[in-house]
Structure formats: structure tokens, C-alpha cells
Amino acid sequence: YDFTNCDFEKIKAAYLSTISKDLITYMSGTKSTEFNNTVSCSNRPHCLTEIQSLTFNPTAGCASLAKEMFAMKTKAALAIWCPGYSETQINATQAMKKRRKRKVTTNKCLEQVSQLQGLWRRFNRPLLKQQ
């Protein structure tokens, strides 16, 4: 999906008002310095591409983030403010067998959510020069 035509300011508002709080809740009890940010993004569409990938694609050691509240809110925000996004998701779901996975918080998941927080922070500051 090409995130170029999304309403970035509305997505930012949704992040600031609710998604960010859920990410913080997920990370509670973890030191902010515990994980290094290794995933970056260069502009807002790129940030959303990385956020989608990290949030919804299962990875080795962390298969369950898509079940979390912050993921459900991210998905709904993208569906509302990215034209055509919900159609791509409906079609993808119909084409794919449902994979049910238990929600498990592993250290790998905590690291992944830490990366997500960094991507969202970058998304919120699009005029910042890339480090």
C-alpha cells in the first residue's frame, strides 16, 4: 500500500491522543534506554510503511503485536485517513487463512514496540533532518 495520500495530521492527532498511551502502557516497566533504535524512516509515507510492517507482520520471537490495542487503533486510523487502505485489508484478509496466535509479551516484542515508538516519534517530526 502507498501511504502518500494519507491525512498525516489526522493520523498524528490519533497517535498523540490515544495510540501513544497504549504503546507506553505496553512498555511499562521497561527502561527507555533498554533498547537501541535500529529502524528508521525518512518521510511520513516511509514511516507509515515501517510502522505497518513492524506492527502487523509477525517476526521471529514476536508474533502477536497485531492483537494489541495500539495495533487495532493504528489499523483503524490508517483505514479512516488513508484512502483505499481498508479495501486492501479486506481483500488481504479474504485471501489469507486466519492465523490465530496467542498474545505473548516477549523481550523481542518489547524491543519491537520500542522501535515502533521511535518510528512514531519520527513520523511526528517530518521536518527534522535524518540523523
Epitope: K67, E68, M72, K73, K75, Q89, K98, R99
Partner: nanobody, 118 residues
Framework: EVQLVESGGGLVQPGGSLRLSCAAS????????MGWFRQAPGKERELVSA???????LYADSVKGRFTISADNSKNTAYLQMNSLKPEDTAVYYC????????????WGQGTLVTVSS
């Protein structure tokens, strides 16, 4: 398996109001999102509003300030109060549910037609 049943659609004049209901039955979970989608003839299905189990809500710009989404967890029912209706709100409205055991809005209602016309 979750079943969703919508009600409340119908014909209404511009400026009028309708309240849609979506009752969920079956195995539901505490962590969820309920969404109201609509599909006008010849257009893509769009998500107009969503409510989450923590009470937070999201609205599309086209309905913000006119539509209000709410949920009664004790009845496993979501509502969409639609005020100041416009002809462009005419569509089939679907409620959909996703919970912490499922994927992208796995559960859908049958749809209810809302027609705004004088």
C-alpha cells in the same frame, strides 16, 4: 464465532436523524474495536467511525460532529447516532468487529440501508 446484527436503517429527510444498532452475540472478548463502515453505490467501502474497548473513538472527517459512536458493553451492542444527515450519507452501513483473537474486522453484519432523500 461472533454474529453481528444491525438495525435502524431507513429513509430519512435531509437534516434528519437515525440511530443504527449493532448487536454482537457469540464468543466476544474484552479487548475489541467496533467499526461502522459504509458503502455507497459505485464507491469503496469506507470506515466512518470506530470505538475501542477502552472507550476511545475515531471519526472520519466527513461525519465528525454529526455522527456519534457509542457502545454498551453489558449488551454487547454498538450504536451510531447520525444527526444532520445529508444526501451524500446515503449508503449501506455495515458494523464490523475485531477483537484480540481475530484479524482485520473478521466479523461483519449484513448491512442496513440508509437513504437520505426528500
Amino acid at each position: 464465532e461472533v454474529q453481528l446484527v444491525e438495525s435502524g436503517g431507513g429513509l430519512v429527510q435531509p437534516g434528519g436523524s437515525l440511530r443504527l444498532s449493532c448487536a454482537a452475540s457469540g464468543r466476544t472478548f474484552r479487548s475489541y474495536v467496533m467499526g461502522w463502515f459504509r458503502q455507497a453505490p459505485g464507491k469503496e467501502r469506507e470506515l466512518v467511525s470506530a470505538i475501542f474497548s477502552d472507550g476511545s473513538t475515531l471519526y472520519a472527517d466527513s461525519v465528525k460532529g454529526r455522527f456519534t459512536i457509542s457502545a454498551d458493553n453489558s449488551k454487547n451492542t454498538a450504536y451510531l447516532q447520525m444527526n444532520s444527515l445529508k444526501p451524500e450519507d446515503t449508503a449501506v452501513y455495515y458494523c464490523a468487529r475485531e477483537d484480540s483473537s481475530s484479524g482485520w474486522f473478521d466479523y461483519w453484519g449484513q448491512g442496513t440501508l440508509v437513504t437520505v432523500s426528500s
